[in-house]
């Protein structure tokens, strides 16, 4: 699966929450970031994530002219120079400092499961999605026979009116 351009086709800031409206938050602890899934208090600010969308071409593209096999890949960055990475060995989702070009582990295939919710499939391990497990993000294997609409891999992106990326 190759990214067809080194620049994202679009970027925007959004807050990320689970299908059950828990917030995904990021905390700096001992010089590394931890990712939490938690209920926020009423007026507590939601953390924002910079989503960068890239076009990619599926390797089994049959049509040759590129009309088939296009996918949207996203990277997710909650703070400058840090991106969510898939750790396929540990089945975990981690925040790592990276330089561009980003490693494949930082890219996720975007799936729209409902009109306002999305899922993130690991580029490096097809069939494995970012999901919620024990109040943390984890990598969850979804069998192709299962319905991808399983709630623990569904996330909502809510718009933010702030245009900075801290």
């Amino acid at each position: 699966m190759s990214i067809t351009g080194i620049s994202p086709i679009t970027e925007y800031l959004a807050s990320l929450s689970t299908y059950n409206d828990q917030s995904i938050t990021f905390a700096l602890e001992d010089e590394s970031y931890e990712i939490y899934v938690e209920d926020l208090k009423k007026d507590e600010k939601k953390d924002k994530v910079l989503l960068s969308y890239y076009e990619s071409q599926h390797p089994s593209n049959e049509s040759g002219d590129g009309v088939d096999g296009k996918m949207l890949m996203v990277t997710l960055s909650p703070t400058k120079d840090f991106w969510l990475h898939a750790n396929n060995k540990e089945h975990s989702v981690e925040l790592h400092k990276s330089e561009k070009p980003l490693p494949d582990q930082a890219f996720f295939v975007l799936h729209n499961m409902h009109s306002n919710s999305v899922s993130f499939e690991s580029k490096t391990d097809p069939g494995v999605f970012i999901g919620v497990k024990d109040n943390h993000l984890a990598l969850i294997k979804v069998d192709s026979s299962e319905n991808l609409s399983t709630e623990n891999i569904l996330f909502k992106l809510s718009e933010t009116h702030h245009h900075h990326h801290h």
Epitope: E62, K70, N147
Partner: antibody, heavy 121, light 106 residues
């Protein structure tokens, strides 16, 4: 080459039913969201209905909810729009369209030529 | 529901003119916006996706810009074959078209 061919349109009386079909070719049908969009004579475009790639999630314009049903047969590369209790305001050319990306509900990359539905007594 | 408002409804310009079409969303749509061109008697055609990305095969005189609620389609040098109706379309939350801008040659 991507092709979308709609059939099933025609003249129908108010309150009756019609089923539109759209046969797709030239792409991996089961990986794409599919859509129906309509255009009343001399008017603008109006999104009608969407279905995700595995058919598990469907969406409708409020005014057609409960009357129209979108479905798909991935083995036959076909998407359908079953239209019941038709009204005169449903008179339009109905277009079938495919998404731009695998798995994503973004952009109508290709459109069929449309099929005209006329609801009149 | 998100409403999309296009202006002007009709735009008349000369060949070679720079033409700007506007589209305003009722809420922030995070650049999830396309532009479609429809010529008389034809199906619509995707011109621009995600606000500013040119669909393959579309002439480079077409460009898109915008963010938040305000978006623009620009034709840098209007050609006779650009006579058509142009629709903006949002897919940030549900799916909604604008009412269209008809572009004519003076």
């Amino acid at each position: 080459e991507v092709q979308l061919v709609e059939t099933g349109g025609g003249l129908v009386q108010p309150g009756r039913s019609l089923k539109l079909s759209c046969v797709a070719s030239g792409f991996t049908f089961s990986n794409y969201w599919m859509y129906w969009i309509r255009q009343a004579p001399g008017m603008g475009l109006e999104w009608v209905s969407s279905i995700n790639n595995d058919g598990g999630n469907t969406y409708y314009l409020d005014s057609v909810k409960g009357r129209f049903t979108i479905s798909r047969n991935n083995a036959e590369n076909t998407v359908y729009l079953q239209m019941n209790s038709l009204r005169s305001e449903d008179t339009a050319t109905y277009y079938c369209a495919k998404g731009r990306y695998y798995y994503s509900s973004y952009s109508f990359a290709y459109w069929g030529q449309g099929t005209l539905v006329t609801v009149s007594s | 529901d998100i409403q999309m408002t296009q202006s002007p409804s009709v735009l008349s310009a000369s060949v070679g003119d720079r033409v700007t079409l506007s589209c305003k969303a009722s809420h922030n749509i995070n650049k999830h916006l396309d532009w479609y061109q429809q010529k008389v008697g034809e199906a619509p055609k995707l011109l621009i996706y995600f606000t500013n990305n040119l669909q393959t095969g579309i002439p480079s005189r077409f460009s898109g810009s915008g963010s938040g609620t305000d978006y623009t389609l620009t034709i840098s040098s209007l050609q006779p074959e650009d006579v058509a109706t142009y629709f903006c379309f949002q897919y940030n939350s549900g799916w909604t078209f604008g009412q269209g801008t008809k572009v004519e040659i003076k």
